[in-house]
Interface confidence: medium
């Protein structure tokens, strides 16, 4: 009796092999797909990290894309100087030169007449004169007492450049822009043979109900904390220090049942601003029990411990902490490289290969 296969059987074997191959390829593809969720309180740097991914892994912003940010740069600059001027009234700070009071009213009128994406020479002149004023500078130095964009000084110090009629924002200008994220922004890129899907989520508490239940099957969570927020008050809730708000959110994420098998990566961000602030504002503003010195290293290490101690499953869950400056492309590149290695290692572990 011969053991030759009929044409029908051969086709069935081929089909079976093809199914196996497809399953294997699907499995490999799934293993190469990385779903990253960016979480953190408002203005902690999540969207800046996303912008960095575009710069590092997608050849950055084209000239055309940069041009589209011009209106945001102008809006951020104008909002910043207006926030400082308004705060002067509340903090009872006088202008160094009384003639600046005229400029302040002129600012409001000109800003209200400004066309989006344009800055007239007179508006630029008014802002420049105000920014140079000693009273305005004194108020700027007390910015922890009111809400001010982190990028305020960056743009205001560079007004001569950004007010040029032919101004095109640079990659760094784009990185520094502040637009409140509403809803969920998805970004895709490939790195180290992995296909990343990164989800940027609005940090303000009003946004949280939109995403908290949606993200099972996430490979890793990058949780951003603004280190420099230790002496600020939360915008939506004047009662709670921003750092404590951030800790509360981290606690709820880190110990959430949906994220039991999810790697938690902690970005202690804005380390550059923190390093400057800690020289002037003691950490006891945020942590009255802190007895260490107000050096960058010791204060930063203390904040790191405060967050890592919130992890209730220390035996089974590791938190991977990095100190970051989201506006520094080299720093983000280095950190993200390390993060990817952790993800690869954990993926191999899940497949029993490590």
């Amino acid at each position: 009796m011969g053991c030759t296969l009929s044409a029908e059987d051969k086709a069935a074997v081929e089909r079976s092999k093809m199914i196996d191959r497809n399953l294997r390829e699907d499995g490999e593809k799934a293993a190469r797909e990385v779903k990253l969720l960016l979480l953190g309180a408002g203005e902690s740097g999540k969207s800046t990290i996303v912008k960095q991914m575009k710069i590092i892994h997608e050849a950055g912003y084209s000239e055309e894309e940069c041009k589209q940010y011009k209106a945001v740069v102008y809006s951020n600059t104008i909002q910043s100087i207006i926030a400082i001027i308004r705060a002067m009234g509340r903090l009872k700070i006088d202008f160094g030169d009384s003639a600046r009071a005229d400029d302040a009213r002129q600012l409001f009128v000109l800003a209200g007449a400004a066309e989006e994406g344009f800055m007239t020479a007179e508006l630029a002149g008014v802002i420049k004169r105000l920014w140079k004023d000693s009273g305005v500078q004194a108020c700027f130095n007390r910015s922890r007492e009111y809400q001010l964009n982190d990028s305020a000084a960056y743009y205001l110090n560079d007004l001569d450049r950004i007010a040029q009629p032919n101004y095109i924002p640079t990659q760094q200008d784009v990185l520094r822009t502040r637009v409140k994220t509403t809803g969920i922004v998805e970004t895709h890129f490939t790195f180290k043979d992995l296909h990343f899907k990164m989800f940027d989520v609005g940090g303000q508490r009003s946004e949280r109900k939109k995403w908290i239940h949606c993200f099972e099957g996430v490979t890793a969570i990058i949780f951003c904390v603004a280190l420099s927020d230790y002496d600020l008050v939360l915008a939506e809730d004047e009662e709670m220090n921003r750092m404590h708000e951030s800790m509360k959110l981290f606690d709820s994420i880190c110990n959430n049942k949906w994220f039991t098998d999810t790697s938690i990566i902690l970005f202690l961000n804005k380390k550059d601003l923190f390093e400057e602030k800690i020289k002037k504002s003691p950490l006891t503003i945020c942590y009255p029990e802190y007895a260490g010195s107000n050096t960058y290293e010791e204060a930063a290490a203390y904040i790191q411990c405060q967050f890592e101690d919130l992890n209730k499953r220390k035996d089974t869950k590791e938190i991977y902490t990095h100190f970051t400056c989201a506006t520094d492309t080299k720093n983000v590149q280095f950190v993200f490289d390390a993060v990817t290695d952790v993800i690869i290692k954990n993926n191999l572990k899940d497949c029993g290969l490590f």
């Epitope: 809006s75 409001f108 800003a111």
Partner: nanobody
């Protein structure tokens, strides 16, 4: 539709007086801080004076302080600028404008302006 219509501009001799008016419609005038702004030939816009929504506080630019008086009548939806001791430097097109509600993106409303000429 928001409308601001200025009137009262004229040719006047140095040292003379004028009273400008601005009739507002299409918005709740009584809730807006209002401004007078001027533009001299070949020059940029210059803020002149402002008045709070209920007329309690007023502000003046340095060059006009003590000579100009801003006032309003919310029952008539009208803004005024009394100009005394006029100088050649005061010659300009005078506009009334709302204070911008969100401070940016073309949120202030402007009138078409009224011409003030100061000459002997």
């Amino acid at each position: 539709e928001v409308q601001l219509v200025e009137s009262g501009g004229d040719l006047v001799q140095p040292g003379g007086s004028l009273r400008l008016s601005c009739a507002a419609s299409g918005f709740t005038f009584s809730t807006y801080r209002m401004n007078w702004v001027r533009q001299a030939p070949g020059k940029g816009l210059e803020w002149v004076a402002s008045i709070s929504s209920r007329g309690i506080t007023t502000d003046y630019a340095h060059p006009v302080k003590g000579r100009f008086t801003v006032s309003r009548d919310n029952t008539k939806n009208t803004l005024y600028l009394q100009m005394n001791s006029l100088k050649p430097d005061d010659a300009a097109v005078y506009y009334c404008a709302t204070d911008p509600s969100t401070w940016y993106r073309g949120t202030a409303h402007w009138g078409q302006g009224t011409q003030v000429t100061v000459s002997s």
